[in-house]
């Protein structure tokens, strides 16, 4: 008799794929044209990335450091009107993209929560949550919560309002902290909070260190749902050496939890790589005309257009990974086991019941390495086969779908492999 199927866990929409942050509407859309109406026209692009949620804004009226000219219920006219926002929500819904609104109050100022009394601001945030939930948003993000006195209790109140409206709504909190104890204490009083932090960026970017960071985080947070990113707002290129970008995309998409990216991560957009750009919000490179001020400053392989036409580009890798992440049970909610492999490597398995299983092998080193996979520390339910099929490599030159012998597996410098193999009873 066939073994009984394992009961599927409850899946919220943010469990099913990546979130995509657009913190600066104008920079995302390109020079001087950034508003909500224009963003509507980019939803097809977001669909092509297979992201599940768009983390948008802040969009509210905020005069730098001025409480008396900050209104969480009013959209800054530079971004458009409430009607434009409602239209965006409707269009996003039709494309199954959820919209999460950033409500960080003083986003144009020094201290994102103002350097004054937090109580009155926190009370206003509660009213804003209610207002925007009724307007149809799917969740909220608040950043720099380390600057909030009594952050845990405020977050608990805000989460109550968000979840009280619907269990299907999400609260994301961001912190600059990379301290695990601090992160865990923020998570403790908020059962469904997603927390983005600088935890993973506090790394020496070696396989061993990354493995230990990931396992410590998962152990400390228990069986709660995690999110994975390198910061609460920044681009991957701001934290990673260029040669590790592909590796990290593969890792973020295959760890257990929700991957969170910033606009431009999918093309390797660099902060301030071009003259005159603000560091925190570089202009999205849609095509070679995205930066008209300096002719020739943008080459095709830096742009969405150019990378869309190149199957070996970072954008193509992102799309492939996002597709796998959103449809494979083992990647959606599978168990996670790390195991020993060669020095400089980080390897793990994702598996769910009798579904296809996935093996991820990441070489963080500057030299080619033999994988040296040792399955002895894996539980019986997650044993390794002798061969696995290649889903993708972060480097060119390997044939997708080809079977690879795991005992003889070698990786190029900075190469990551995603392999699949069937469940065997």
């Amino acid at each position: 008799r066939a073994p009984r199927c394992r009961e599927l866990p409850a899946q919220k929409w943010w469990h099913t794929g990546a979130l995509y942050r657009i913190g600066d509407l104008q920079a995302f859309q390109g020079h001087g044209s950034g508003n909500l109406a224009g963003l509507k026209g980019r939803l097809d692009y977001l669909s092509s990335l297979k992201v599940k949620g768009l983390v948008l804004g802040p969009l509210h009226k905020n005069q730098k450091d001025d409480v008396a000219q900050t209104d969480l219920l009013q959209i800054d006219p530079n971004f458009g009107s409430k009607e434009d926002f409602d239209n965006l929500l409707q269009s996003a819904k039709k494309k199954s993209i959820r919209v999460i609104l950033d409500l960080t109050p003083n986003y144009r100022g020094e201290n994102l929560w103002f350097s004054t009394q937090v109580d009155s601001v926190a009370t206003k945030v509660k009213d804003a949550l209610e207002f925007w939930l009724q307007a149809g948003v799917d969740g909220f993000q608040v950043r720099d919560i380390e600057n909030l006195k009594d952050a845990s209790s405020f977050l608990a109140e805000w989460e109550n309002i968000t979840k009280g409206f619907s269990e299907d709504r999400l609260l994301i909190a961001g912190t600059n902290s990379s301290d695990l104890q601090q992160i865990v204490s923020l998570l403790e009083s908020n059962k469904d909070l997603l927390l983005t932090s600088s935890y993973l960026s506090d790394s020496s970017f070696t396989g061993e260190h990354t493995k230990s960071l990931v396992t410590q985080y998962l152990n400390a947070t228990g069986n709660r749902w995690c999110s994975w990113s390198l910061s609460q707002a920044g681009l991957l290129t701001s934290f990673l050496p260029a040669q590790l970008l592909r590796l990290y995309q593969l890792m973020l998409f295959t760890l257990p939890g929700t991957p969170v990216f910033s606009y431009g991560d999918e093309i390797g957009l660099k902060a301030a790589a071009l003259p005159g750009q603000p560091v925190e919000a570089p202009v999205m490179l849609w095509d070679e005309s995205s930066f008209p001020d300096i002719p020739g400053a943008v080459s095709a392989n830096m742009t969405v257009k150019g990378q869309s036409e190149d199957p070996g580009s970072l954008l193509s890798l992102f799309r492939q990974l996002s597709d796998q992440r959103s449809k494979e049970r083992s990647l959606l909610h599978g168990d996670f086991h790390t195991f020993s492999s060669g020095p400089g490597l980080f390897s793990y398995i994702r598996h769910w019941d009798q579904n296809e299983r996935f093996l991820v092998v990441l070489n963080f080193g500057d030299v080619g390495l033999s994988a040296g996979l040792q399955a002895s520390d894996l539980p019986a339910s997650a044993s390794l086969p002798t061969k696995a099929d290649l889903v993708l490599s972060t480097q060119p030159g390997r044939e997708e779908g080809s079977p690879l012998e795991l005992e003889r597996l070698k990786l190029e410098p900075h190469e990551g492999l995603l392999l699949r193999f069937p469940y065997v009873a």
Partner: antibody
């Protein structure tokens, strides 16, 4: 023009109940939080209760907690204050006031008030 | 709760005078201080919010200042229509609390 008009005041016996109303016009009522503030004869102003635009967030002064209930009917642009177990010290002019949407909290518009007298 | 104190309960001044009314909070209220005017007929209006911001339609002869726990309202050129009671109020924390009021009369 923002307009707030209170009604429902009058003479009530101690231990009795009363419901005050505040009719709002000239603004999108459901967007704004609303307060009740009172003023006893020859005394200062005292904040009584607050309700957010969608009725999710409600707060009361300790002196009325458990006895007064603030509510609103957004389609009818009306704010209410249901008062029970009334005491002589609840005798006052009752004002409804609108809360600004700015982070700099304040009562930006007030009604003209309705007088409640609690006496036997 | 934060206590708000207006030490002067009544004040006499002549038309054209510069009048200052003060208000003290029992703890730092970080500029979340508002001033209201109550006319003899009971009508209440917001004059100044967040220490020094003039509410729309309020004449520019009204101004506010202060920080921390100490705040003041100034009428630079007293007019007949300014005869009223003035209340300060903190918006820093719940419950919102008011000062006892300062009644302004003409000499």
């Amino acid at each position: 023009d923002v307009q707030l008009v209170e009604s429902g005041g009058g003479l009530v016996q101690p231990g009795g109940s009363r419901k005050l109303s505040c009719a709002a016009s000239g603004f999108t009522f459901s967007t704004f939080g609303m307060h009740w503030v009172r003023q006893a004869p020859e005394k200062g102003l005292e904040w009584v209760a607050y309700i957010s635009g969608g009725s999710t967030n409600i707060y009361y002064a300790d002196t009325v907690k458990g006895r007064f209930t603030i509510s609103r009917d957004n389609p009818k642009n009306t704010l209410f204050l249901q008062m029970t177990s009334l005491r002589s010290e609840d005798t006052a002019m009752y004002y409804c006031a609108r809360e600004t949407t700015l982070l700099a909290t304040n009562f930006d518009y007030w009604g003209q008030g309705t007088t409640l007298t609690v006496s036997s | 709760d934060i206590q708000m104190t207006q030490t002067t309960s009544s004040l006499s001044a002549s038309l054209g005078d510069r009048v200052t009314i003060s208000c003290r909070a029992s703890q730092d209220i970080s500029n979340y201080l508002n001033w209201y005017q109550q006319k003899p007929d009971g009508t209440v209006k917001l004059l100044i919010y967040y220490t020094s911001r003039l509410h729309s339609g309020v004449p520019s002869r009204f101004s506010g200042s202060g920080s921390g726990t100490d705040y003041s309202l100034t009428i630079s050129n007293l007019e007949q229509e300014d005869i009223a009671t003035y209340f300060c109020q903190q918006g820093s924390t719940l419950p919102r609390t008011f000062g006892g009021g300062t009644k302004l009369e003409i000499k």
